[in-house]
């Protein structure tokens, strides 16, 4: 707390500019008044204060405005965002794209700070749902973003807004994510044509269930080793060899050097031996020629 | 963030330097500059600023000797120091925009002017 004093003589800021840079903190204190400080936020952004500097005027805004900042003084807070505390932000409505936009342009190259997530969540739950235009702005200043959301969260996501997720966005997405994705990205590219469609669902075919991956496995998309590996394992056991065979085209080849990791090593022993013969490759592992498979789940379920 | 100040040195009195301070990313292009400095025994004080419009500003005391500049393009602010006095001697450092904020700063450079 910086102690209240009188202003100096001829010290009284008339406007916020440069010159406050060379105030002692108590001089910005005594002399520079809040609600100037608030009309002209704009400025401090402009002006290099220090962070004991940006502390006295975060102390002098939230004695004006106690129950929270108005979004008018928010939108300018630049550098003075990093001075708030997540309880500081709760206190916040902010509606504005805009206002989101220049807080996280603050932090921008930086980690994602418990102050910005807080700002998010506001920000979202205000709006109610997470529309494209505000994915578009978050994965643009923070391509993680998606993944850090809980699948119940995702659910809130509008199959629009898969338009505006790029792949990177989803690489540290795991399996109980892509599988509340993926249905929002079918349905939002169900009218491209196949090889458009296989572009775009791509980074989502992680929560794809095995009878999508068999109609692909007809459209000759030509999957790429890195997309296959990260099926989930359940929707790849039951596909036949000719299915994976077409479903990766040429990049068949690329199994034999991924024979010892899931998904491929499950799918290859749940293979007959002769079948995985005829790609040629020397996968081992299949069920031997003669033995008989019981599906011991189908029976389960049938009982 | 990294800052790398450079360019001090023993000086006589009357003598010039240039001091450089470079940072990582785009951060001195976008932000508003300052020029410190801290005398031993006192606190850290702005010499000279320069707002992200370009305007410029300086301690009296310092005022009509010093000059803050900066290369863009190179991500880099210079103090350009003329009719160096004693009083000058100090270590100095250069900051702004998100590194200033958090209170993050360089090692500064080392003036001495006997």
């Known amino acids: 707390e910086v102690e209240k004093t009188a202003c100096p003589s001829g010290k009284k800021a008339r406007e916020i500019d440069e010159s406050l840079i060379f105030y002692k903190k108590w001089e910005l204190e005594a002399c520079v008044d809040a609600a100037l400080l608030a009309t002209q936020m704009d400025r401090v952004n402009a002006i290099p204060f220090t962070y004991e500097q940006l502390d006295v005027l975060k102390h002098k805004l939230d004695e004006l405005y106690p129950q929270g900042y108005p979004e008018s003084v928010i939108q300018h807070l630049g550098y003075l965002f990093l001075k708030m505390s997540p309880e500081d932000i709760r206190k916040w409505n902010v509606t504005s794209l805009e206002t989101l936009k220049a807080l996280l342009e603050v932090n921008k190259g930086h980690e994602m700070s418990p102050q910005v997530a807080t700002l998010i969540d506001r920000f979202v739950k205000g709006r109610g749902q997470l529309d494209k235009d505000t994915l578009d702005t978050l994965t643009a200043f923070y391509p993680g973003y998606l993944c850090s959301l809980s699948p119940e969260e995702l659910s809130s996501v509008p199959p629009s807004s898969i338009w505006a997720v790029r792949p990177q966005d989803l690489d540290t997405c795991d399996p109980r994510q892509l599988d509340v994705l993926y249905p929002k990205a079918r349905l939002a590219f169900q009218n491209m044509n196949g090889s458009e469609y296989f572009v775009k669902i791509q980074s989502f075919l992680g929560g794809a269930p095995t009878e999508d991956l068999k109609a692909l496995s007809q459209q000759n998309v030509s999957m790429d080793l890195a997309t296959f590996m990260k099926l989930r394992t359940d929707a790849v056991l039951p596909l036949t060899v000719a299915e994976v065979q077409k479903l990766l085209g040429p990049h068949v080849e690329g199994l034999k050097a991924e024979e010892r990791h899931r998904p491929v090593r499950d799918w290859i022993l749940r293979q007959r031996q002769d079948d995985l013969d005829t790609l040629g490759l020397g996968l081992q592992g299949g069920i031997p020629n003669g033995y008989l498979v019981l599906d011991l789940s189908m029976q389960e379920a049938l009982s | 963030v990294q800052l790398v100040e450079s360019g001090g040195g023993l000086v006589q009195p009357g003598g010039s330097l240039r001091l450089s301070c470079a940072a990582s990313?785009?951060?001195?292009?976008?932000?508003?500059v300052a020029w410190y400095r801290q005398a031993p025994g006192e606190q850290r004080e702005p010499v000279a600023a320069?707002?992200?419009?370009?305007?410029?500003i300086y301690a009296d005391s310092v005022k009509g000797r010093f000059t803050i500049s900066r290369d863009n393009a190179k991500n880099t602010v210079y103090l350009q120091m003329n009719s160096l006095k004693p009083e000058d001697t100090a270590v100095y450092y250069c900051?702004?925009?998100?590194?200033?904020?958090?209170?993050?700063w360089g090692q500064g450079t080392s003036v001495t002017v006997s």
């Open positions: 900051n702004g925009g998100w590194s200033q904020a958090m209170d993050y």
């Open positions: 990313g785009s951060m001195f292009s976008i932000n508003a």
């Open positions: 320069m707002t992200s419009g370009g305007s410029t």
